[in-house]
C-alpha cells in the first residue's frame, strides 16, 4: 500500500490559446486531470489501471501552483494505491479551460483540451522527487512526483506491513525495510523477551521487564547465585536451595542443637576453662582457688579439687598441678577426645570406638550422613534434573520443575516447536534442530505464512492478440494492454482508429 | 527459641514519617531473607517489602515503591523500614517475617500497629 | 499480581470433624504454595510450605494437598486449638501474594 504522489509546480501558456490554436476567453481557467497506470512502451488509451485524479481549477494562462499539502491537501496530488508497487508506471497529464464551474468530463466542449504529456518509466519508492519539465508548441508544464509508502508500510515495494508497538504482544519500531527493531531492553522474534539484568543467572533467574532479575523459589540475591536455606534452619547456610548445613558449633536436622555452649554462653566465671560435653551441656575448669558448677566459688588451691577427670593434686610453691589418668590432658586434666560414652552421633546412629577408646566413628542410618550422622542426605545434590529444571524434595522421592521449552520426569525432552500450532494460514510446521520451518499454503508466504501473496490473474493467459496482461494486484483481477488495432478488455476487437479517451 | 520484636509503631500524620525495626534472636540473622508483611485492621495479609541476606538485595510492592525503604544490620541483628509520606491506606499491624518473596514466612514477629491519621 | 481465592470465607464445625479449605490461583502457580494459622491479636503461624510439607511442630493432622491452580488444606480431626483464621500464600510470582483468609469458627 502507498501513494503517487505529483507535485504540479508551474505552468506556461503565455498566449493564453487551447490545443486546437483557438484563445480562451477571457483567459484560460485551467485545471488538470491526471491518469496513472501500468507501463505502457507506447502510452495509449484504456483504464486509468491505477487511478485518476482530478484538480480544481488552479490559475489563468500562465501560473505557478503553491505547495497546499498543510492546507486541503490538493497539492501535490495524492493517487494511492492498495498493491506491490511493480516498479514502472505511465503517467497522462492534461491541462483544460473550464469556461464555467462544473468541471466534470461530460461538461465541457471537446475543443477545451489545452494541452496533453503522457510519461512512462521506471521509479523506485523513495523519499526523493523527481523534476521533470514537458514542453508543447504553445505550452510548458513543470512538475515532480515521486512513490512512497503509506503508514505501516515498508519495503522496495510497499508490501511489508510493520506498525510499532509497545505492549503485551512486542516492544519495537519499524525499520525502512518493514524490519522490526526491538525498543532497548528487548529481544525476540517479535521483542516480547526482555532483556534480564546483566549477569542474573540464566537458570535461576528470570524477568518480566527489562533489566530486572527476579529469583525463582530457592534463591535470592541482586542475579539470584544465593540459595535460602531450609524454612526451618536456625543456625545453617545452603550452597543449594533449603539445605541447611550448620555453622560452626551447631548439629542436628535444623542446626538448632548447641554444640558449642561454651563459645555461645560463656558459662564459666573466674576464668575457668569450659568444656563442651554433649548437646546444651558443659564442664567448668576452674582456676585454682575456685570452685562451683561455673567456677564462681572461691576455694583454696588443692582444696578445690582443681584436677578433673580423676586427676590427682600436688601441691608446688607457685601453685599446683595436676596428674592426669590415661585419656585425659590439660592444666586440669580438663581435656578429652570425646568417646561413645558421650552419645555423638545424631538421628539414630550407631557409634563404634576406635583406638582403645581413644576416637569413635559414627555409622549412620539411610538418609543421613555426616561424622555425627547431623546432616539429612539431600536427594537433589547430584543435580538429576537437566536442562536448569528444577529439583524439588517429595516426600520419599524427587521432582523435577522444567524451564519453558522441556518436558519429562528429568526434564531431559525437548517440547515441540510445532505444539504450539505457529504457522498461520494452514501452514505445515516441521521441526528442525534450531527451531521450526513452516511450508506455506498458494497465495500465503512469510516465516509463519503470516504474508498474504496476490494469486497471479496473468498466468491463465487472458488477453488476446499478443496483448501484454499486468495484474491489478489490489482486487486479484488482470488488464489486458491492447496491441495498435484492437480493443476489449482482452484485446479480442479489432478496430480501424483507436477511441478517444473516455473521460 | 527464634524471636523477632518489632518495635517504632505508633500514630502519625499523613506525610509523615516512620521507622520501624525487628530485633532478630535465636537463628543465624546473617544467613538468611528477611521481609516485612502488613495486615490492614480486619483485612487480610500483605507482603511489603524483602531484602536478601548477603548482598541486601531489595524489592517493593508498587504501592509503596519510592516512599519505603528497608535494611538490615547484620552485626545488631536487626531489619529496619523506613516509611516515608505515609498515606491513611498504610493504616496496618506491620509484621517483621524471615523470608523472602519466593519462599513462605517461617517466622514472624508479634506486630507493631502503625496508624497514619490527622 | 496472582490471585488466591480462598473458599469458604467461613466455616463452623465441632470438634472431632474432619474440615477442608480450598484456594485457587489464578495462574499456575506449580507447588510454591504456603498455608498459614492466625489466632486474635496474634501473628500468623507457618503450617504447611510447598503445598504438603509440614512446618516444624506442626501436629500430623493437618495437610495439604493440590498443583497448579488447585489447593486443599486439610484437618482430619479438629482440635479446640485450631479455631481460628486460615490464610494460604503463593510465592512463585512476584509480588507474593495471600488468600483472603478463611475464618474457622465453633459450631
Known amino acids: 500500500s502507498g501513494v503517487f504522489q505529483l507535485q504540479l509546480q508551474e505552468f506556461i501558456n503565455e498566449r493564453g490559446v487551447l490545443a486546437s490554436g483557438r484563445p480562451c476567453e477571457p483567459g484560460c481557467r485551467t485545471f488538470f486531470r491526471v491518469c496513472l497506470k501500468h507501463f505502457q512502451a507506447v502510452v495509449s488509451p484504456g483504464p486509468c489501471t491505477f487511478g485518476t485524479v482530478s484538480t480544481p481549477v488552479l490559475g489563468t494562462n500562465s501560473f505557478a501552483v503553491r505547495d497546499d499539502s498543510s492546507g486541503g491537501g490538493r497539492n501535490p496530488l495524492q493517487l494511492p494505491f492498495n498493491f506491490t508497487w511493480p516498479g514502472t508506471f505511465s503517467l497522462i497529464i492534461e491541462a483544460w479551460h473550464a469556461p464555467g464551474d462544473d468541471l466534470r468530463p461530460e461538461a465541457l466542449p471537446p475543443d477545451a483540451l489545452i494541452s496533453k504529456i503522457a510519461i512512462q518509466g521506471s521509479l523506485a519508492v523513495g523519499q526523493n522527487w523527481l523534476l521533470d519539465e514537458q514542453t508543447s508548441t504553445l505550452t510548458r508544464l513543470r512538475y515532480s512526483y515521486r512513490v512512497i509508502c503509506s503508514d505501516n508500510y515498508y519495503g522496495d515495494n510497499c508490501s511489508r506491513l510493520c506498525k510499532k508497538r509497545n505492549d503485551h504482544f512486542g516492544h519495537y519500531v519499524c525499520q525502512p525495510d518493514g524490519n522490526l527493531s526491538c525498543l532497548p531492553g528487548w529481544t525476540g522474534e517479535y521483542c516480547q523477551q526482555p532483556i534480564c539484568l546483566s549477569g542474573c543467572h540464566e537458570q535461576n533467574g528470570y524477568c518480566s521487564k527489562p533489566a530486572e532479575c527476579l529469583c525463582r523459589p530457592g534463591w535470592q540475591g541482586r542475579l539470584c547465585n544465593e540459595c535460602i536455606p531450609h524454612n526451618g534452619c536456625r543456625h545453617g547456610t545452603c550452597s543449594t536451595p533449603w539445605q541447611c548445613t550448620c555453622d560452626e558449633g551447631w548439629g542436628g536436622l535444623f542446626c538448632d542443637q548447641d554444640l558449642n555452649y561454651c563459645t555461645h554462653h560463656s558459662p564459666c566465671k573466674n576464668g575457668a576453662t569450659c568444656s563442651n560435653s554433649g548437646q546444651r551441656s558443659y564442664t567448668c575448669t576452674c582456676r585454682p582457688g575456685y570452685t562451683g558448677v561455673d567456677c564462681e566459688l572461691e576455694l583454696s588451691e588443692c582444696d578445690s579439687n582443681p584436677c578433673r577427670n580423676g586427676g590427682s593434686c600436688k601441691d608446688q610453691e607457685d601453685g599446683y598441678h595436676c596428674l592426669c589418668p590415661p585419656g585425659y590432658y590439660g592444666l586440669h586434666c580438663e581435656h578429652s577426645t570425646l568417646s561413645c560414652a558421650d552419645s555423638p552421633c545424631f538421628n539414630g546412629g550407631s557409634c563404634r570406638e576406635r583406638n582403645q577408646g581413644a576416637n569413635y566413628a559414627c555409622e549412620c542410618p539411610p538418609n543421613f550422613t555426616g561424622s555425627n550422622c547431623e546432616k539429612k542426605v539431600d536427594r537433589c545434590t547430584s543435580n538429576p534434573c537437566a536442562n536448569g529444571g528444577q529439583c524439588l524434595n517429595r516426600g520419599p522421592s524427587r521432582m523435577c520443575r522444567c524451564r519453558p521449552g522441556f518436558t519429562g520426569t528429568y526434564c531431559e525432552l525437548h517440547v515441540s516447536d510445532c505444539a504450539r500450532n505457529p504457522c498461520a494460514h494452514g501452514g505445515t510446521c516441521h521441526d528442525l534442530e534450531n527451531g521450526l520451518m513452516c511450508t506455506c499454503p498458494a497465495g500465503f508466504s512469510g516465516r509463519r505464512c503470516e504474508v498474504r501473496t496476490s494469486i497471479d490473474a496473468c498466468a491463465s493467459s487472458p488477453c488476446f492478440n499478443r496483448a501484454t496482461c499486468y495484474t491489478d494486484l489490489s482486487t486479484d483481477t488482470f488488464v489486458c494492454n491492447c496491441p495498435y488495432g484492437f480493443v476489449g478488455s482482452r484485446c479480442e476487437f479489432p478496430v480501424g482508429l483507436p477511441p478517444s479517451f473516455p473521460w | 527459641e527464634v524471636q523477632l520484636v518489632e518495635s517504632g509503631g505508633g500514630l502519625v500524620q499523613p506525610g509523615g514519617s516512620l521507622r520501624l525495626s525487628c530485633a532478630a534472636s535465636g537463628f543465624t540473622f546473617s544467613n538468611f531473607p528477611m521481609a516485612w508483611v502488613r495486615q490492614a485492621p480486619g483485612k487480610g495479609l500483605e507482603w511489603v517489602a524483602t531484602i536478601s541476606s548477603s548482598d541486601g538485595t531489595t524489592y517493593y510492592r508498587d504501592s509503596v515503591k519510592g516512599r519505603f525503604t528497608i535494611s538490615r544490620d547484620n552485626a545488631k541483628n536487626s531489619l529496619y523500614l523506613q516509611m516515608n509520606s505515609l498515606r491513611a491506606e498504610d493504616t496496618a499491624v506491620y509484621y517483621c517475617a524471615r523470608g523472602y518473596y519466593n519462599s513462605p514466612f517461617a517466622y514472624w514477629g508479634q506486630g507493631t500497629l502503625v496508624t497514619v491519621s490527622s | 499480581d496472582i490471585q488466591m481465592t480462598q473458599s469458604p470465607s467461613s466455616l463452623s464445625a465441632s470438634v472431632g470433624d474432619r474440615v477442608t479449605i480450598t484456594c485457587r490461583a489464578s495462574q499456575d502457580i506449580y507447588i510454591n504454595l504456603a498455608w498459614y494459622q492466625q489466632k486474635p491479636g496474634k501473628s500468623p503461624k507457618l503450617l504447611i510450605f510447598?503445598?504438603?510439607d509440614l512446618a516444624d511442630g506442626v501436629p500430623s493432622r493437618f495437610s495439604g494437598s493440590g498443583s497448579g491452580t488447585d489447593f486443599t488444606l486439610t484437618i482430619s480431626s479438629l482440635q479446640p486449638e485450631d479455631f481460628a483464621t486460615y490464610y494460604c500464600?503463593?510465592?512463585?510470582?512476584?509480588?507474593?501474594?495471600f488468600g483472603q483468609g478463611t475464618k474457622l469458627e465453633i459450631k
Open positions: 510447598d503445598t504438603n
Open positions: 500464600q503463593q510465592y512463585d510470582y512476584v509480588p507474593p501474594t
